[in-house]
């Protein structure tokens, strides 16, 4: 029985050109995490394998950095990065847990309207 739950950073609104950290945390289970996949829509961004470490997809190598932890850092954000991101935890013996984060990337002029943007 799958007892675990995924906690995420929550949805994020950020400025074009900035960077953000996507993070998920698996709790309430003793299952062993064997691999974490980060995906956007149907695209694989990165894999963190318990034995083999990190692999970043070639098309994202220049803008995606591993970590912190099992999280992912997206840099040089563009409006085209807007969309839903998935952290997919492969565990034993539970199976697969999925967390979802929606990232909205805005033109910097929108900052004038009072939104507080995330640019670490």
């Amino acid at each position: 029985m799958m007892t675990g739950t995924i906690e995420t950073t929550g949805n994020i609104s950020a400025e074009k050109g900035g960077s953000i950290i996507l993070q998920c945390h698996l709790s309430s289970t003793t299952a062993q995490v064997t691999q974490v996949n980060w995906e956007q829509q149907d695209q694989l961004l990165a894999i963190c394998n318990a034995d083999l470490g990190w692999h970043i997809s070639p098309s994202f190598k220049d803008r995606v950095a591993p970590g912190p932890g099992l999280g992912l850092t997206l840099q040089s954000l563009t409006v085209n990065d807007t969309g839903e991101y998935f952290c997919i935890y492969h565990t034993y013996p539970d199976g697969t847990y999925t967390g979802r984060i929606f990232l909205e990337v805005l033109e910097s002029s929108v900052a004038e309207h009072g939104a507080r943007f995330q640019i670490p």
């Epitope: 949805n11 085209n80 807007t82 939104a115 995330q118």
Partner: antibody
């Protein structure tokens, strides 16, 4: 002036599918998400999902995966929601609503489309 | 999914009253950057819902200053300082911090 004009009321038979439209005007269409909300029995509201016209990125409430499909036609500033394999549980008023940039809220709403599923 | 619990379900009022509506979430609505995506809507009979408050406490354009929002974490409040006839209807909170977005069950503001 921001306006969202939805298609008219529909009466459909169980098992059928249908598509609701939402035509936007008065703003830069591709720069804002378009969301869809269901209101059943004149009370509770449920968020079905959204689309970002700039890149057609979508996000769905998993409760409605396989039930609702959201698409966009940028040339006509129109968003569509297709409802599949309709049952009486799908009888409701469906609203499109623009996302408020930077705040994950809904700032402008269409007038609503009433869908009745009945044999 | 995040559960949004609104109280009371029904709120009988007299014009001129000050009222508060509570909205509690099953988990914190602050994202990892400290932003909280909690908004309030009024749905009047025969109309579409409309936005009153976004980001906990920001009044949307055209919303009278008798409406105010407050709160943090899991506990949020909408206050209406002086009830007017046009304020009657269903009030809903909405969280947009976690997927999927979820609404509260609604509070019906009606004349006593």
């Amino acid at each position: 002036e921001v306006q969202l004009q939805q298609s008219g009321p529909e009466m459909v038979k169980p098992g059928a599918s249908m598509k609701i439209s939402c035509k936007a005007s008065g703003y830069s269409f591709t720069g804002y998400t378009m969301n869809w909300v269901k209101q059943s029995h004149g009370k509770n509201l449920e968020w079905l999902g959204l689309i970002f016209p700039y890149n057609s990125a979508t996000s769905y409430n998993q409760k409605f995966t396989g039930k609702a499909t959201i698409t966009v036609d940028k040339s006509s500033n129109t968003t569509y929601m297709e409802l599949l394999s309709l049952t009486s549980e799908d009888s409701a008023v469906y609203y499109c609503a623009r996302g408020l940039r930077g705040f994950f809220a809904l700032d402008y709403w269409g007038q609503g489309t009433s869908v009745t599923v009945s044999s | 999914d995040v559960v949004m619990t609104q109280t009371p379900l029904s709120l009988p009022v007299s014009f001129g009253d000050q009222v508060s509506i509570s909205c509690r979430s099953s988990q914190s609505l602050a994202n990892s950057y400290g932003n909280t995506y909690l908004s309030w809507y009024l749905h009047k009979p025969g109309q579409s819902p409309h936005l009153l408050i976004y980001g906990i406490s920001n009044r949307f354009s055209g919303v009278p200053d008798r409406f105010s929002g407050s709160g943090s974490g899991t506990d949020f409040t909408l206050k209406i300082s002086t009830i007017k006839p046009e304020d009657l209807g269903m009030y809903y909170c909405l969280q947009g911090t976690h997927q999927p977005w979820t609404f509260g069950g609604g509070t019906k503001l009606e004349i006593r």
